[in-house]
């Protein structure tokens, strides 16, 4: 970067090279070039010469002033016009950064996705800081009082093998950067209470043309958790609001859920599960589409595919799993 160049003098920033976004800053340049009394000192930002707000302080030093500096990063360097030199002579350069101190991390959440072998901790970091911000996740055993710390720049995966202080822990997050430090509230967890079952997946659907046509949704999970509660939500694709059905589920069988739906409508289905009585849910599964047949049988039929219908006794759909849902706010 610009900081690695050989300098003939130096450049510095007040109040600091990393400062709060929107501040007024001064960049000073002092030449120390042999046999050169600089005629003029020039400042460059990201390779472009600055024209305004430059003040000559003395024979070797000049100042560039910025009001309300809003750029997250900039490369600054300064040059001198020496009397006997045809080209400008480089004095020195510096990378500067502006940003914000971290917000207090909140919504600290730790879950163990079944079969992951890791405790995954996430949090809401708050507003963008624009500068390098590190997070220290503190995990303290409530049984042994031992504390472990994990450094990360976003979320953290902690191997359950490394959690050797029993099953009850306090977890909190410290956020720190050059402009400040904040600490979250403490989250109390029990490892067995934060396991999220292996993903539930809708595999296919069929509509049976009985007196009252009914749609059967087939869905499954590879979980080995005994007591699992699930929700299936569905709606016509033209609707905004979801209908939700709840199930207590034993995944020794493929689940079959029955719905009485309007004819000739395209519906979308999703499912999610949690260990019964526990806090955290899976994210909603991929969107699964199924179109119900018309009530009056017609001659035409379409090929069997992800989103399909025909006019025989049954109408079936199978999932290709390409579409994913908006999973915001699903874990809490």
């Amino acid at each position: 970067g610009i900081t690695n160049i050989n300098c003939s003098g130096h450049i510095w920033v007040e109040p600091a090279t990393i400062f709060k976004m929107g501040m007024n800053i001064s960049i000073y340049c002092q030449a120390a070039i042999k046999n050169c009394q600089p005629r003029k000192l020039h400042f460059y930002k990201n390779g472009i010469k600055e024209r305004f707000q430059i003040t000559r302080i003395n024979k070797t030093t000049a100042r560039l002033w910025y009001k309300n500096f809003l750029e997250p990063h900039a490369s600054m360097y300064c040059t001198a016009e020496c009397p006997k030199h045809f080209q400008e002579t480089l004095i020195c350069g510096k990378d500067i950064s502006s940003g914000y101190p971290p917000d207090i991390p909140d919504e600290v959440t730790c879950v163990i996705y079944e079969y992951s072998g890791n405790m995954t901790c996430t949090w809401n970091a708050g507003k963008l800081t624009y500068i390098d911000t590190k997070y220290v996740v503190h995990v303290k055993s409530l049984e042994t009082e031992e504390e472990q710390q994990y450094l990360t720049s976003s979320y953290i995966n902690i191997s359950t093998d490394s959690l050797q202080g029993g099953k009850k822990y306090l977890v909190w997050v410290q956020a720190a950067n050059a402009l400040g430090m904040e600490e979250s509230k403490q989250l109390q967890i029990h490892l067995d209470d934060i396991v999220i079952p292996s993903a539930a997946v809708i595999s296919r659907a069929e509509t049976i043309n009985a007196t009252v046509p009914k749609t059967i949704i087939y869905w499954d999970s590879q979980t080995t958790i005994e007591k699992v509660s699930c929700e299936m939500r569905y709606k016509a694709t033209t609707n905004q609001t979801w209908n939700v059905k709840e199930f207590d589920t034993n995944f020794t069988y493929v689940q079959q859920s029955e719905f009485y739906l309007e004819p000739n409508i395209k519906y979308v289905f999703q499912v999610r599960c949690q260990e019964t009585g526990k806090r955290y849910w899976q994210p909603w599964s991929s969107l699964f589409f199924h179109k119900t047949p018309e009530t009056v049988p017609q001659v035409t039929s379409k090929a069997f595919q992800h989103d399909t219908w025909n006019s025989g006794l049954t109408v079936a759909s199978i999932s290709t799993g390409h579409l994913t849902s908006d999973n915001r706010g699903d874990i809490g």
Epitope: I112, E114, Y115, S116, G117, N118, M119, E143, T160, D161, L163, Q164, G165, G166, K167, L191, V195, S198, Q222, T223, T224, I225, E226, N250, F251, T252, Y253
Partner: antibody
């Protein structure tokens, strides 16, 4: 790293009891279940019992009256005791860990090397 | 108790070939099945868990399939070190049970 090691007497007289200690390292017994499995010479695997992370136990029906499993979390040791041994109890006895968080319920991801037990007078 | 019927009890095959072992459960067990490999004089080693998932460090030539009562285990391209014993294992209910084992022999 994760290790389990069984230590037993090798030879047990008929009608006597068998005591095996499984010493573990690299993980905490407060977080993991320990299963006991045996293998008779030239035979398959037979599950005997388990001590769950919270200290509860379950045993195979045929062994309920003569099998006891306990543990000392602080010493990282699990104790297996079987009474009234007969010749057909001759086998290699294994302790094995269930890593519930990685592999789900009752799946044994690490096994001890086994201790060979011969029941003979 | 849930009975696991594993077949064949022994199978001969050549290097590079594929082999499939089946395991039938006496009642439905969902995906709650594991497969282990056992080398002579060694303890069993986990290969497949949750019926279809590969355990850490296990080569991808091993695979599992099935759910409910019928399960299969496949080795796609046999290596010399694969000619050992294999066991299925149900995790669904206590008492846990194992299949009778399959001995894989080199032709």
């Amino acid at each position: 790293q994760v290790q389990l090691k069984e230590s037993g007497p090798g030879l047990v007289a008929p009608s006597q009891s068998l005591s095996i200690t499984c010493t573990v390292s690299g993980f905490s017994l407060t977080n993991y279940d320990i299963h006991w499995v045996r293998q008779s010479p030239g035979k398959g695997l037979e599950w005997l019992g388990v001590i769950w992370s919270d200290g509860r136990t379950d045993y195979k029906g045929a062994f309920i009256s003569r099998l006891s499993i306990s543990k000392d979390n602080s010493k990282s040791q699990v104790f297996f005791k079987m009474n009234s041994l007969q010749a057909d109890d001759t086998a290699i006895y294994y302790c094995a860990r269930n890593n519930y968080y990685r592999y789900g319920r009752n799946t044994m991801d690490y096994w001890g090397q086994g201790t060979s037990v011969t029941v003979s007078s | 108790d849930i009975v696991l019927t594993q077949s064949p009890a022994s199978q001969s095959a050549s290097l590079g070939e594929s082999v499939t072992i089946t395991c039938l459960a006496s009642q439905t067990i969902g995906s709650w099945l594991a497969w282990y490999q056992q080398k002579p004089g060694k303890s069993p080693q986990l290969l497949i868990y949750a019926a279809t998932r590969l355990a850490d460090g296990v080569p991808s030539r091993f695979s599992g399939s099935g759910s409910g009562t019928k399960f299969s285990f496949k080795i796609s391209s046999l290596q010399a070190e694969d000619f050992v014993f294999y066991y299925c294992h149900q995790l669904y209910s206590i008492p846990l049970t194992f299949g009778g084992g399959t001995k894989l022999e080199m032709k």
